[in-house]
Amino acid sequence: QPDSVSIPITCCFNVINRKIPIQRLESYTRITNIQCPKEAVIFKTKRGKEVCADPKERWVRDSMKHLDQIFQNLKP
């Protein structure tokens, strides 16, 4: 675990150009705040780190769908 506690992030000023394997991802949040410079998706990894990604990229959309399916299956 990190040595100090994180607070929720608000904006992505840049996005990653590397594809993150789906098995490393735990959840995601859409960033649509009008005050942020760009629309983005923030993935949370199983390690607890956050990754800014471009929702226009195919791997990002596929990862979001996959995580949606996982959460849907968890619902009673």
Partner: antibody, heavy 119, light 107 residues
């Protein structure tokens, strides 16, 4: 294009505290998803990861150095810093700052700054 | 901590040769491995991530493979500008650890 630049004293006396700063240009240190790291390389040797800080202040330190290091961030100056206390000759190294985009790959590095510990 | 063992520690090869470097982890790290190139007096540069994915802008003569504990880094046709030291880095566990490096020279 984000660039990193280390700065600090090139010579530190044994038992003193080493302080280094990394200035981020071409982008905001406050961006989500960026983890700001310190890595060092002893002369003629391999690389040793020291620790990281997130813009929120969240840190993780290498346990081998944890008792002696502090990594801090100043978002107003677009800088993050390393302090290493009680230095010895074994802390003589090139110190690099580097960014990872949350996926644990160091994709942007500073050019490195050589720090010698000597009386 | 996970120990990363690279071999060989140094090697000499001719322009056009196929060069292979290996990295062995002390425990299973899946494919959580990166490769870096460090030229003399310069900072390391990311070449390969997730064991086999080429970083943007890196020439296709570089490649990586492997999973678990055994990994391979290959330069398909060695070029003079490839003179450097190459490092593997695992990220399965924190703290991150690097191999000791492989110094590549041209014959």
């Amino acid at each position: 294009q984000v660039q990193l630049q280390e700065s600090g004293p090139g010579l530190v006396k044994p038992s003193q505290t080493l302080s280094l700063t990394c200035t981020v240009s071409g982008g905001s240190i406050s961006s989500g998803g960026n983890y700001w790291n310190w890595i060092r390389q002893h002369p003629g040797k391999g690389l040793e990861w020291i620790g990281y800080i997130y813009y929120s202040g969240n840190t993780y330190y290498n346990p081998s150095l944890k008792s002696r290091i502090t990594i801090s961030i100043d978002t107003s100056k677009n800088q993050f810093s390393l302090t290493l206390s009680s230095v010895t000759a074994a802390d003589t190294a090139v110190y690099y700052c580097a960014r990872d985009g949350g996926d644990d790959a160091f994709d942007i590095w500073g050019q490195g700054t050589m720090v010698t510990v000597s009386s | 901590d996970i120990q990363m063992t690279q071999s060989p520690s140094s090697l000499s090869a001719s322009v056009g040769d196929r060069v292979t470097i290996t990295c062995q982890a002390s425990q299973d790290i899946s494919n959580y491995l990166n490769w870096y190139q460090q030229k003399p007096g310069k900072a390391p540069k990311l070449l390969i991530y997730d064991a086999s994915n080429l970083e943007t802008g890196v020439p296709s003569r570089f490649s990586g493979s492997g999973s678990g504990t055994d990994f391979t880094f290959t330069i398909n046709s060695l070029q003079p500008e490839d003179i450097a030291t190459y490092y593997c880095q695992e990220y399965n566990n924190l703290p991150y650890s690097f191999g000791q490096g492989t110094k590549l020279e041209i014959k």
